[in-house]
């Protein structure tokens, strides 16, 4: 899916009102400093192609975030603000309904939402501090 | 466990040319911009180029461009420097490091490869 | 093209602060990065953005920027501090990285 013509204002604000709330609730009892940076991301677009990736593509470490509350909620942020978007996942909820639920919160999956959380702080900031 | 390791390094005769590659491992390779940084015997640091996270631009140093070509390939995770018409002045260790960029601006380079040595002597 | 001018050498004895500088044209506009490397070693990032530090690089390491004029200022110098350190930017109007000269650090 192309993330281009999202409405990132709207993206942004349910970001800071609801998901921020959720992925630092999961992160809770560790500091963003236990997790050195994996991934970053260069423009919004591209943050939000990353964030889709880490948040629904199960890994072999950690294959339950799709399941977490900060994750439906990205989703339905994306699903609103970004045209299209809802028709491109409908293949992917079904096959992700067929696997088994896993419910522990891996130490990968810790440092998974950790980078998360990187790749969400890239895409609020319009700029860099300075040029 | 987040790694760069040049490799290609060693002696060459002016005029000719060398290929140095870089293996990235550890983080998510496609998502950060690639640099090559070299230091010649005794002196500071030079920059030499650097390589969007898409591959899609790339940027030189004055002092190589039109002989070396910077290039990666993402499926790999590999970074390359292909130098032609090499001068004695290319002497030096040959880094690569990756920084995050925002838009077209480059960050710190926050990891670096220990170097490989090219050496362009007759 | 821009250019970034440091002292070639600085020296500091054990316990005290040591101040590197580096000059260049309006640079207070531009976000400044500082790198220590130690013979036959790799550079490393110890401050980034003016005066963020990277979580393994001790408190100790701080910086500056405005003006004309960014500083790098370690404090509480130790001997294995002795390093060459390096200001470098990214010039947006030329689309380059540029390394200051560097300076060798000298714990007395």
């Known amino acids: 899916y192309d993330f281009t013509n999202c409405d990132f204002q709207k993206i942004e604000a349910d970001y800071l009102r609801t998901i921020s709330k959720d992925l630092i609730t999961y992160m809770s009892g560790t500091k963003s400093t236990d997790f050195n940076n994996t991934v970053s991301c260069s423009n919004r677009p591209h943050c939000l192609t990353e964030i889709q990736s880490l948040t629904f593509n199960p890994t072999p470490r950690c294959a339950s975030l799709a399941k977490e509350m900060f994750a439906r909620k990205t989703k339905a942020t994306l699903a609103l603000w970004c045209p299209g978007y809802s028709e491109t996942q409908i293949n992917a909820t079904q096959a992700m309904k067929k696997r088994r639920k896993r419910k522990v919160t891996t130490n990968k999956c810790l440092e998974q939402v950790s980078q998360l959380l990187g790749l969400w702080r890239r895409f609020i900031r319009t700029l860099l501090k300075k040029q | 466990q987040m790694q760069l390791v040049e490799s290609g390094g060693g002696v060459v005769q002016p005029g000719r040319s060398l290929r140095l590659s870089c293996a990235a491992s550890g983080f998510t390779f496609r998502t950060y911009g690639m640099h090559w940084v070299r230091q010649a015997p005794g002196k500071g640091l030079e920059w030499v180029a650097v390589?969007?996270?898409?591959?899609?631009?790339?940027h030189y140093a004055d002092s190589v461009k039109g002989r070396f070509t910077i290039t990666r390939d993402n499926s790999k995770n590999t970074l390359n420097l292909q130098m032609n018409s090499l001068r004695a002045e290319d002497t030096a260790v040959y880094y690569c490091s990756r920084s995050p960029q925002w838009e077209d601006i480059f960050e710190a380079m926050d990891i670096w490869g220990q170097g490989t040595m090219v050496t362009v002597s007759s | 093209s821009y250019v970034l001018t440091q002292p070639p050498s600085v020296s500091v004895a054990p316990g005290q602060t040591a101040r590197i500088t580096c000059g260049g044209n309006?640079?207070?506009?531009?976000?400044v990065h500082w790198y220590q490397q130690k013979p036959g070693q790799a550079p490393v990032l110890v401050v980034y953005?003016?005066?963020d530090r990277p979580s393994w690089i001790p408190e100790r390491f701080s910086g500056s920027n405005s003006g004309n004029t960014a500083t790098l200022t370690i404090s509480r110098g130790e001997a294995g501090d002795e390093a060459d350190y390096y200001c470098q930017v990214w010039d947006s109007s030329s689309s380059l990285v540029v390394f200051g000269g560097g300076t060798k650090l000298t714990v007395l």
């Open positions: 390589v969007w996270y898409s591959g899609s631009y790339t």
């Open positions: 309006n640079i207070g506009s531009k976000s």
């Open positions: 953005d003016d005066s």
